[in-house]
Structure formats: C-alpha cells, structure tokens
C-alpha cells in the first residue's frame, strides 16, 4: 500500500508531517504494486549501504544510475551505482549527478533548461501533457513542437524538466508529472535512500537549486535515521 508514502512535495519549509499527511498511519489510499510510478520504493539507509540490483535507472536513487558494476561485466547483473560528477565520463544523462547531463561522453553542468535527475526521465507511463492549452488533453506526441514555444508554468503538466520554465522542475504528483518550483535554501528536500521500502514516491519534490545540496539539517544529526530532516544547504 501507499500508506507509508511520505507526502512531502509541498514546497514549504515544513518538516513532516506538516508537509503532508500521506505518511500517517490510516492514510486512506492503497495501490497495486507498481501502480503509476515504478522505482520509488527501493531505498535503504546510507548507513547500511548494500548494492541494490536494478534493471533501469528509475529504480535507483537520484544520485545513482543503473549499470553493471564492472566494465564489460555481465549485463544481466546490474546494480545502482553512484552518479558521476562533472567532467567524468558518461554514456547517458542518468549517469551524471543532478545538475549535470551527458554531453559528448562527459558530464557537464546543466543550463537552466536542461535539469536532470530521477524526476526528469521521459515519462513512459500513459500520462499526457497539457503544457500549452492546459485543457488536460493535448497529446504527448505534440510535446516537442509545442514546448519550443511555450515553457510550462508552475502547475502545468510536463514530461521532463526541460518542458518547464526556468526555476521549475518536472516532478511526479499522483498520476501526473507537473512543473514544481526548484527548492531554495532552507527548504525541506528528499534525500533518496533505497531499501526499507517506504512505498511509491508519488509526491516528488524538486531538487535543490544551483549551489545547494540536500543534506541533513545540523540540529537533526542526533535524530534516528528514519526521522532525519534534510534541507537544501549551501555547498
């Protein structure tokens, strides 16, 4: 069920549960396994890191990608690997850490219209987009032509963050992906962990803005792993 999903996408400087109540026991929702958004339920605490087997990048955390652990290794055995930092070699965008993308085989810094991260993958589920007329019924197939003219504003349906205006990212919300504000300094963020399933992440926050990273709030270091509050902080 999704009872344990932490509904934390209200872009406000509020600790759970004030940021949302889906994480409360008795939250009135349930779902079939894999419903709507795959891959959000495979987190584990950083303190107890073990390689996590995967089939695709979406199954890994924001700071990871899915690949064979050894160069030229068995393609059938893939695990979540740490993302590659700027100027490191890459073969696809997902290999590069948030804020970067793969260009000519090297991870380079994203410009404002090319954010990436777990929430940036082209959505393969059956959800359309309505970024221009916003009537809810523009087709996905019209995306490329329309998006060159109009960038989605906050609340617009999107497929990827490049569909959204500057300062916004494309993040999941229920059965949709919509443009949400990129997080500012001090705002609560989601630090992705893999195991110890907390249900499907259907309430995504954006990533932290430029020059910020999602880190444990200093006064929460003593708290238990599960209750640590992460906020966007200066590098």
């Amino acid at each position: 069920t999704l009872n344990s999903v932490l509904n934390s996408n209200a872009i406000k400087n509020l600790p759970p549960p004030l940021g949302g109540a889906a994480g409360h026991p008795g939250s009135a929702v349930s779902a079939a396994p894999g419903i709507l958004y795959p891959g959000g339920n495979k987190y584990q605490t950083i303190d107890n890191y073990q390689p996590y087997p995967c089939a695709e990048d979406e199954e890994c955390g924001t700071d990871e990608y899915c690949a064979s652990p050894t160069r030229g290794g068995d393609a059938g055995v893939q695990i979540c690997l740490a993302c590659r930092k700027r100027r490191k070699r890459c073969m696809r965008h997902a290999m590069c850490c948030p804020g970067n993308y793969c260009k000519n085989g090297i991870c380079v810094s994203s410009d404002q219209n090319h954010f990436r991260g777990e929430i940036e993958e082209t959505i393969t589920e059956s959800f359309g987009n309505d970024h221009s007329t916003l009537d809810g019924y523009s087709r996905r197939t019209t995306l490329s032509s329309k998006m060159y003219h109009t960038k989605g504003q906050e609340g617009s349906v999107c497929l990827r963050s490049s569909d959204c205006a500057s300062g916004l990212c494309c993040a999941r919300h229920f059965w949709s992906k919509i443009c949400k504000p990129v997080l500012k300094e001090g705002q609560v963020c989601t630090k992705h962990r893999r195991k110890g399933s907390h249900g499907l992440e259907i309430f995504q926050r954006c990533y932290c803005g430029e020059g910020l990273s999602c880190r444990i709030q200093k006064d929460h270091h003593q708290a238990s792993n599960s209750s640590r509050l992460h906020t966007c902080q200066r590098h």
Epitope: L2, N7, N9, A10, I11, K12, L14, L18, G19, G20, A21, A22, S27, A28, V29, A31, A32, G34, I35, L36, E125, S126, F127, G128, N129, D130, D135, G136, Y137, R139, R140, E154, G155, V157, H173, F174, W175, S176, I178, I202, F203
Partner: antibody, heavy 117, light 107 residues
Framework: EVQLLQSAAEVKRPGESLRISCKTS????????MHWVRQMPGKELEWMGV????????SYNQKFKGHVTISADKSSSTAYLQWSSLKASDAAMYYC??????????WGQGTLVTVSS | EIVMTQSPPTLSLSPGERVTLSCRAS??????LNWYQQKPGQAPRLLIY???RLHSGIPARFSGSGSGTDFTLTISSLQPEDFAVYYC?????????FGQGTKLEIK
C-alpha cells in the same frame, strides 16, 4: 473533442452484481488515467479510484477498496466500475473522469444507480 | 484524509454582483486546489486548477487565490448561468477530497 459516454441508469436489489461503463472517444484511451467519482444524493463528490488503461494498474480510495473493482478494456476504449454484491448504501450517481493532471478535466454524464429491495 | 470545508453552505446574490467563495483545508495543501461548478442534473465542470490556473474555455470572471489552508474562488460579476453549486478539491494528498459545496442561488 473528448467525450465520455456512461451507461444508462440501473435499478438493482441488494446483493446483486453490477457493472457500469464509460466509453471514451476523441482521444487516445491509453494516454490518460480514468477516475471514478461517487456522488450520493444531495452530497459532495467522493473520489473512488483510478486506473491507468495502458497497463491496468489501479489505485483505490481505502473507503471503496475491496467493494468495487475498476477495470478497462483498451480494445473498446471503455472503463468499468463494478460491484460483486451491492448494498443499499451504494445508491448514488457515479461519474467517470478522464485526465492527465491532478484535476478532473473531462467528465461523463453520470450513471444513476438505485439499490432497493 | 484531508478535510475540505466550504463556507457559506448557501449564498443568495443577484446577477452583476461580485462573489467570493471560501474553502479551507484541514492542513497545508500548498497550491494543490481545484474548483468545480455543478449545475442540477449535470456533471461537475473544472473551473480552476492548481489554485489559480483557469481551465480552458472558462470565462475570465472566474479567479482563484489563496495558499496553504485558505482559498477563495471569486466571480467578478455574476452571470445568470453562474448560479450553481461550487466544490473545492484538494489534490495534495491521496485520496483527493472535495468540500461539501457552496450553493449559489439567485436572490
């Protein structure tokens, strides 16, 4: 133009089974999620659940889980809401709604279900 | 689940008047609020989504505002066709929930 055409009103007895339908046209059925919403006489709207017609995945409001089943047939671009055993309290107007965003943009005209012994 | 409370339950006004309908959420829902209009014997119709975005085909006299827990739907100048029941809906937390509605009737 998006159109959602729901099946006709039904009069049933408690304990009977029922399946109501929502036939869609004007868009690609598998590209949008389909929701069912209940409205009891003189009451507010209640979200029952959602289906992704492309793969049959469903998510229910806990209040309705186990009592109703949402399904979809891609070949006929039709969504269904069904009960295996109706209760008197199931008497209501039922709407289907097709959408892309976290809002309900297009609605069927509604199917009135009467349950009376 | 999040409880949505609308006020007042009924409002009697004349065409041409400005009206403000209120909706309160039991907890912070950010901007995840939609407004619908329902006329007798008809299905609801989406007016406003994401707090203030006007749905296509909806007249500009409708507008939405607010944030957090308190939201308003404003109709700048009531037209005869605007008399109906208005529902707010939160889509911040599953399950999406609706308010009990505000009935707008002709004075």
């Amino acid at each position: 133009e998006v159109q959602l055409l729901q099946s006709a009103a039904e009069v049933k007895r408690p304990g009977e089974s029922l399946r109501i339908s929502c036939k869609t046209s004007g868009y690609t059925f598998t590209e949008y999620t389909m929701h069912w919403v209940r409205q009891m006489p003189g009451k507010e709207l209640e979200w029952m659940g959602v289906i992704d017609p492309s793969n049959g995945d469903t998510s229910y409001n806990q209040k309705f889980k186990g009592h109703v089943t949402i399904s979809a047939d891609k070949s006929s671009s039709t969504a269904y809401l069904q009960w295996s055993s109706l209760k008197a309290s199931d008497a209501a107007m039922y709407y289907c709604s097709s959408t892309t965003g976290p809002w309900f943009a297009s609605w069927g005209q509604g199917t009135l279900v009467t349950v009376s012994s | 689940e999040i409880v949505m409370t609308q006020s007042p339950p009924t409002l009697s006004l004349s065409p041409g008047e400005r009206v403000t309908l209120s909706c309160r959420a039991s907890q912070d829902i950010s901007n995840y609020l939609n407004w619908y209009q329902q006329k007798p014997g008809q299905a609801p119709r989406l007016l406003i989504y994401y707090k203030s975005r006007l749905h296509s085909g909806i007249p500009a006299r409708f507008s939405g505002s607010g944030s957090g827990t308190d939201f308003t739907l404003t109709i700048s100048s009531l037209q005869p066709e605007d008399f109906a029941v208005y529902y707010c809906q939160q889509v911040h937390t599953l399950p999406p929930t609706f308010g009990q509605g505000t009935k707008l009737e002709i004075k």
